[in-house]
């Protein structure tokens, strides 16, 4: 039975040209995390595998950095980066947990972080 929950940074906003950290955290389970995928809509941005380490998609290499931790840093943000991002935790023995983050990239300097929320 899957008892864990994913806590994410929720709805966040950032300025064009700036950077943002996407973070998820798996709690309420003793399952072992074997891999974390970061996806934007249907595009795979990066994978952190417990055995093999990080692999960043070459398409995003110049604008995506691994970490901190299992998170992902997006740099040189553009308005086109606005949208949904997913952290997908592969675990043993539980299976797969998915968290969602919505990022809005703003032209102005009024970007503020949204509240944190949980996805069961």
């Amino acid at each position: 039975m899957m008892t864990g929950t994913i806590e994410t940074t929720g709805n966040i906003s950032a300025e064009k040209g700036g950077s943002i950290i996407l973070q998820c955290h798996l709690s309420s389970t003793t399952a072992q995390v074997t891999q974390v995928n970061w996806e934007q809509q249907d595009q795979l941005l990066a994978i952190c595998n417990a055995d093999l380490g990080w692999h960043i998609s070459p398409s995003f290499k110049d604008r995506v950095a691994p970490g901190p931790g299992l998170g992902l840093t997006l740099q040189s943000l553009t308005v086109n980066d606005t949208g949904e991002y997913f952290c997908i935790y592969h675990t043993y023995p539980d299976g797969t947990y998915t968290g969602r983050i919505f990022l809005e990239v703003l032209e102005s300097s009024v970007a503020e972080h949204g509240a944190r929320f949980q996805i069961p």
Epitope: D51, G53, S57, S59, K61
Partner: antibody, heavy 117, light 107 residues
Amino acid sequence: EVQLQESGPGLVKPSETLSLTCAASGYSITSGYDWHWIRQPPGKKLEWMGFIRDSGSTVYNPSLKGRITISHDTSKNQFSLKLSSVTAADTAVYFCARGLFWYFDVWGQGTTVTVSS
Amino acid sequence: DIQMTQSPSSLSASVGDRVTITCRTSENIFSYLAWYQQKPGKVPKLLIHNTKTLAEGVPSRFSGSGSGTDFTLTISSLQPEDVATYYCQHHYGNPLTFGQGTKLEIK
């Protein structure tokens, strides 16, 4: 078009070190992807040996740990394999390959290495 | 290590036949499975990754399915140029491992 070409001695004596190089053309080895070595003993299945990232960090097959070293020379756009203390069991066709999320989308032509005295 | 077991080890089929090769893994690899085709004396060629995503330039008669521990490569209508050995490979952990291969021949 990305191309990979292996080179190195075809014959190595037992207990010596096998050294191979893979030259990449059509793509910079520092521009993403991982760069792998895979081998295939005569009539047997493929065996993954290890890889080097564009950053220079490495990951090896635990079965070869202590014997294997993978390095790269970014100025020549090539990466290399060294395998020490070889035995007849290391006789194989050695392939270099480009890795994307740990599957292999581009392969070299392969080079045969025989371990014999 | 994750063990990869392919079946059958060899098979013979006629042109136009539907051919199925299976790969079973010793533990859950989710969808992280690739298939390669190696023609006699040639280099392995990527056919499919992530269980079902066709590599660039691969004919649509090839397809993949499965998840967890059981996976299938299907050739919907066998062609003479499909004579080869087919290997599965997981891309999920260290060490990356391959199946022992399935040798496909034409009747």
